[in-house]
Structure formats: structure tokens, C-alpha cells
Amino acid sequence: VPLDPISVSNSSSQIILKWKPPSDPNGNITHYLVFWERQAEDSELFELDYCLKGLKLPSRTWSPPFESEDSQKHNQSEYEDSAGECCSCPKTDSQILKELEESSFRKTFEDYLHNVVFVPRKTSSGTGAEDPRPSRKRRSLGDVGNVTVAVPTVAAFPNTSSTSVPTSPEEHRPFEKVVNKESLVISGLRHFTGYRIELQACNQDTPEERCSVAAYVSARTMPEAKADDIVGPVTHEIFENNVVHLMWQEPKEPNGLIVLYEVSYRRYGDEELHLCVSRKHFALERGCRLRGLSPGNYSVRIRATSLAGNGSWTEPTYFYVTDYLDVPSNIAK
């Protein structure tokens, strides 16, 4: 098994993967296989109303760049904190002995996995676009559930993040073959998205590829600078009883997903008022309604909040609320 895989993101579309060769390989390592797949955001994020008092905004961080070659021994996933700067204690004799035993066990166990769990496969000429391993069967070990990946659907259901379709874990996954090095830059990824990366060491190229058990690591790409900005105009309609319906477009490709919108509005000469609009409410109204407004000139600004934080405020939109009692009901506003 490749050792100490570390994954970090250095941009909104790339993840850098580094690892160390197996300590006791079965023969010569000829190449490594790296597979990656997009992780669906937790369904709870889509369902909770983050405008409710006391509900903390979810935070997701991307995988930060390397500090130094050896400072991170463990997988740094988006759910882990960086370890403090500490030195490891000198190893005792019993620890050294235990490690030797573990190393020997690992080698024996890998041999077992090769012969029993995995069926060797014929190599097929993959282009790197999809998993070229249809003949390889993994016996059920009880730990492979449905993996959901986001895919686009019809225009009525806009965001790719809105839709998730289960796929088989070994179907159509992008992969790359790595020869003569222990690192890989994975490019062309979606911004602020979690990826699960699988790494295998192989000791035979053709005709039958023999590869190790996979080592897994997770990483999240960095946010895209303007992805959470609301594009297009904030429009409004003034209905009877001076109800103002504000409408705007959801950011097309947000960082992760939009969890809420902040609406900031004020009547000329008054204090600014704030309104929180949840995903649920936005799905109901494609915006929000301001009720009980006193007559006067108003300005309104809106910003989206995603898993990566706040987008920019929109340019102010202005509207005028008349004294409803003085206005004939069918005058076009």
C-alpha cells in the first residue's frame, strides 16, 4: 500500500497528491494508479434552515497547501484540524519491535489480498477518461455503499448541485497512471468540491496488472472567487397592500451550495434592516416578500452565503412604496 498519502489544493480546480512508496513492496513498483471521484455534499446541508436562530452556519474548508515535506504525516481532510507543531518522542525498543511485526504482517496480508480478494485483470488501453477495469471484481467487504455524484439535469432543476444520482463506485471514474514519481497534480476539478482519491501501487504493467489495496484520502478544492455572487438584476414587484416581492437568480455554480441569502434594505433616512432567506424560502418564492412597508423610497442589497462564506453584495436596487390607500388598485406599478 502506498504510504502517507497527502492531498492538498492549490487552486479552485486542482488537487496535489503526494505519497511515499510502500515500505515492503511485492516486487518492483512499476507504476501507481490514482482514481478520484466527486463527493456529494451532505444531504443535511440542503435540508436545514440556516436562518433559524441558534443554527450555526456549516463551515467547510479546502485542503491547505503543504507546509513542508514532512510536517504532515497524516491525511489532512477538510474535517481535520492541522496538528500543532510538535516533535515525535524517541521510539522505545518495544515500539520498534511492534513496527517490524506490523510491517511483516502488512506484507503477508497484502499477499493474501492479492490472491484472494482481488481477481487479477487484463490491462486495457485506457485513455484516462474512465476506469478501464470492467473485469476486476471486488468481493463484498461490506464497506462500499452507494456513492452519489452530482450530475446536471433538465433546466427546470438548475444547479448541478441540486441533483444527485447514485453511481457504482467503480464506474466511469477518471484516473491517471503515474510512472517514476510519487506525486500527481489532478486538474480540471470543480471549485470548492470534496473529492475522494484512491491510490494503488502496481508491480506489473502487462499483460496482467497486479495492484495493491487502495489507500484513500480526501481533499476539497479551493473556492472560486466570484462563484457566490448573484448575477443579473434584483427585480421587484409591488403587489396590493404594499407587499414587495424581491426576486433574484441563484448563483449558477456556487462554492458547494448556497445555504442562505441576506437581504439588507432601508427606507431613506431610516436604519438598515436585515432579512435572512433560507434555501427553502427561496425555493418557494424565488426571492422573498417584504410586508408592512411604510411609504417612502427604499434601497435593497442582497448577498448569498455558501459553504465557503459570503458572496458580494449586489448593487443596490431602488423602489418606491406609495401610500396604498391613495392608489387605484389597477395602476401599473
Epitope: S43, F46, E47, L48, D49, T153, A156, F157, S162, T163, S164, V165, E237, I238, F239, E240, V243, H245, M247, R279, K280, F282, A283, L284, E285, R286, G287, R289, S329, N330, I331, A332, K333
Partner: antibody, heavy 119, light 115 residues
Framework: EVQLVQSGAEVKKPGESLKISCKGS????????IGWVRQMPGRGLEWMGI????????RYSPSFQGQVTISVDKSISTAYLQWSSLKASDTAMYYC????????????WGQGTLVTVSS | QAMLTQPASLSASPGASASLTCTLR?????????IYWYRQKSGSPPQSVLR?????????DSGVPSRFSGSKDVSANAGILLISGLQSEDEADYYC?????????FGGGTQLTVL
């Protein structure tokens, strides 16, 4: 493909209870409101209410408040419409439809469930 | 008074045009609303035809021919569905729909007959 599939036709007696279903697929079920619409024989469409599968928040039309219950089981992407005590006047075709606040209105629709209440 | 009023029936000849109206109750201004149009053929669920708010903000459903168009008559406070070059397959019940006060409101429907 985005679609809503409804349960089959039902024939019931007055006073009986009933629960009909609407299963969504091809989209993130918990992110869109689902509405129910009644169409009595030879009559027009009447909006009954909507539910948000994410947290089961429900809004009823005043005409149907207290007459029916709208619920959801998000684990199986299914919305329900139920009656505790049916009346002959509940005989109708019932449709579920996905709600879009703007741009698409109610779309797509289920194929409909015909409920017949007769003694 | 009903919130949305549609004529119960309308007849026209093949090749002619049909103008289906949806009149909003006094006090509800048609200018502010998206008017949604649906058609329903016997035994089938309603199908979306088009949405109309203004000439610059409207959309026809995919698969719906350009013979179908929307408009508004502000003076009559009504939404209009215009079907030109009528064909026998256009025969159906047509419903208008608005999102009003966080609730969907349907018109009573118009039965269009192509003679």
C-alpha cells in the same frame, strides 16, 4: 429523467381512511416543494397545498385546511396525501406536481391517482 | 368573485387563431404577475405550455410550437394565450395559473374546440 410517479387508483367507502403517494426521482427531492392538485369529475384544477420535503414544512389552501393531511418521507423521496374519513365529495383525480417559484410554475406532474368514494 | 376568470368554452376553425383570456380580479394587478398556461387533454395530467410576464420575460415549454404565444391586456387586467394556425391536436382544456400571496391559484379553465 425528472419524474413523479403516483400510486394506483383507489375505491373506498365513505368514512374510510386513505393515503396516496407520489414518488420523485431524477432530482434532489428534498430541495423542491411538492404540491397537490384536485380535479373533480368534469371540473377544473384546484390547488390543495404544498410541502417542503427537506423539513416537512406544509402550506394548505384554506379550502383544504383540516380536510386532508400532506406529509413526506424524504428517505424514500415520497410525498403523501391522506384522509382520515373519506366523503363521497372526495371522489376526484389527484395530481402531485413539483413547485417552481418562477419560470416553470408546477412542473413536472405525476400521472394522477383516481380516488372513488362510494357506498 | 373568482380570483382568475376564464371563459368556459371557445370554438374556432382549423387554421384560425384563438385568443384565450384569463382575467384577474379587481385589486390584483396583472402587470405584476407571471401568468402560467397549461393544457390538459382528456385522461392526462396537465402539461405546461408557457409562462408570460412581459415580452422580454416569457418562455415557452420545450416541444410547444411557436404558434403558442403569451401577452397581457393591461386595460382588461387579463393574461392572454394566443394560438395561431389552429390544429385539431390543439383541442384541450386550457388553464391559467398565478402564484399569489404564496399560494397557487388556478383559473376555471377554457375548453377549446377545433371545429
Amino acid at each position: 429523467e425528472v419524474q413523479l410517479v403516483q400510486s394506483g387508483a383507489e375505491v373506498k367507502k365513505p368514512g374510510e381512511s386513505l393515503k396516496i403517494s407520489c414518488k420523485g426521482s431524477g432530482y434532489r427531492f428534498t430541495s423542491y416543494w411538492i404540491g397537490w392538485v384536485r380535479q373533480m369529475p368534469g371540473r377544473g384544477l384546484e390547488w390543495m397545498g404544498i410541502i417542503y420535503p427537506g423539513d416537512s414544512d406544509t402550506r394548505y389552501s384554506p379550502s383544504f385546511q383540516g380536510q386532508v393531511t400532506i406529509s413526506v418521507d424524504k428517505s424514500i423521496s415520497t410525498a403523501y396525501l391522506q384522509w382520515s374519513s373519506l366523503k363521497a365529495s372526495d371522489t376526484a383525480m389527484y395530481y402531485c406536481a413539483t413547485h417552481h417559484a418562477s419560470g416553470r410554475g408546477l412542473d413536472p406532474w405525476g400521472q394522477g391517482t383516481l380516488v372513488t368514494v362510494s357506498s | 368573485q373568482a380570483m382568475l376568470t376564464q371563459p368556459a368554452s371557445l370554438s374556432a376553425s382549423p387554421g384560425a387563431s384563438a385568443s384565450l383570456t384569463c382575467t384577474l380580479r379587481s385589486g390584483i394587478n396583472v402587470v405584476a404577475y407571471n401568468i402560467y398556461w397549461y393544457r390538459q387533454k382528456s385522461g392526462s395530467p396537465p402539461q405546461s405550455v408557457l409562462r408570460y410576464k412581459s415580452d422580454s420575460d416569457s418562455e415557452r415549454d420545450s416541444g410547444v410550437p411557436s404558434r403558442f404565444s403569451g401577452s397581457k391586456d393591461v386595460s382588461a387586467n387579463a393574461g392572454i394565450l394566443l394560438i395561431s394556425g389552429l390544429q385539431s391536436e390543439d383541442e384541450a382544456d386550457y388553464y391559467c395559473l398565478i402564484w399569489h400571496n404564496s399560494a397557487w391559484v388556478f383559473g376555471g379553465g377554457t375548453q377549446l374546440t377545433v371545429l
